[in-house]
């Protein structure tokens, strides 16, 4: 039994929030300030993520878990764990390397992020434009011209919504 214990890694007893200190006979030492270990048996603690500048702190670092960041207002998160912050634009704009630029005629963006997308081409579905598009809003397709002949009902179900990012072919 003694032989088995001596072969066992003494560091495996060190819980999260500590590290196995080789300089102190493999004693479990608490993680120093601004560092953490999220699992047991660690030989070092990891440096806490710093949320500064474009990032702000969503969750403080603790001895057992890293800090979590989000973006300062005016920017939004990109990537896993908010690894980047990207500038917001106004509706009717898209972000380019030159900053926020208005959508070109015939395109729209109804969000603060993403790209300007082409207006729906109502005629592809055999429909007519009921409400014109703007930089901020897609066109609204109405009934086809044939549906507007006398005696025909002027109420038709709306055209199916396109998936974001898919422009009409």
């Amino acid at each position: 039994f003694e032989r088995t214990r001596s072969l066992q890694d003494p560091c495996s007893n060190c819980p999260a929030g500590t590290f196995c200190d080789n300089n102190r006979n493999q004693i479990c030492s608490p993680c120093p300030p601004n560092s953490f270990s999220s699992a047991g048996g660690q030989r070092t603690c990891d440096i806490c993520r710093q949320c500064k500048g474009v990032f702000r702190t969503r969750k403080e670092c603790s001895s057992t878990s890293n800090a979590e960041c989000d973006c300062t207002p005016g920017f939004h998160c990109l990537g896993a764990g908010c690894s980047m912050c990207e500038q917001d634009c106004k509706q009717g704009q898209e972000l380019t390397k030159k900053g926020c630029k208005d959508c070109c005629f015939g395109t729209f963006n109804d969000q603060k992020r993403g790209i300007c997308r082409p207006w729906t081409n109502c005629s592809l579905d055999g429909k007519s434009v009921l409400v014109n598009g703007t930089k901020e809003r897609d066109v609204v397709c109405g009934p086809s011209p044939a549906d507007l002949s006398p005696g025909a009902s002027s109420v038709t179900p709306p055209a199916p919504a396109r998936e974001p990012g898919h422009s009409p072919q």
Partner: nanobody, 123 residues
Framework: EVQLVESGGGLVQPGGSLRLSCAAT?????NYWMNWVRQAPGKGLEW???????????YYVDSVKGRFTISRDNAKNSLYLQMSSLRAEDTAVYYC????????????????SGQGTTVTVSS
């Protein structure tokens, strides 16, 4: 450790000039687009300017065009913002920020920024 440290802020009178510097450590500056962003008191963060890897492309928010100049010295791993004809509305904390991998292609995300330097324009 990847780090950006801004300096050069201060109190300046309207119409005056300042030059902000940003020292990069822990990475090679010449591989990245770099940006300046700012946050005025009580306002959201605003993008100010960016510059591509070799300095051949530079872009500015409309409100600073003709007054601010972004530049870089890759040999010194440093980024600069020359500010002239300063106005009260330029009062803000200015941050240097690195464009993340794929900046300008897939996204315009910033992945590293400094603690900021404060610019106050007042008489």
């Amino acid at each position: 450790e990847v780090q950006l440290v801004e300096s050069g802020g201060g109190l300046v009178q309207p119409g005056g000039s300042l030059r902000l510097s940003c020292a990069a450590t822990g990475f090679t500056l010449s591989n990245y687009w770099m940006n300046w962003v700012r946050q005025a008191p009580g306002k959201g963060l605003e993008w100010v300017a960016n510059i591509n890897q070799d300095g051949s492309e530079r872009y500015y928010v409309d409100s600073v065009k003709g007054r601010f100049t972004i530049s870089r010295d890759n040999a010194k791993n440093s980024l600069y913002l020359q500010m002239s004809s300063l106005r009260a509305e330029d009062t803000a904390v200015y941050y240097c920020a690195r464009g993340g991998e794929g900046y300008g292609v897939d996204h315009y995300g910033l992945d590293v920024s400094g603690q900021g330097t404060t610019v106050t324009v007042s008489s």
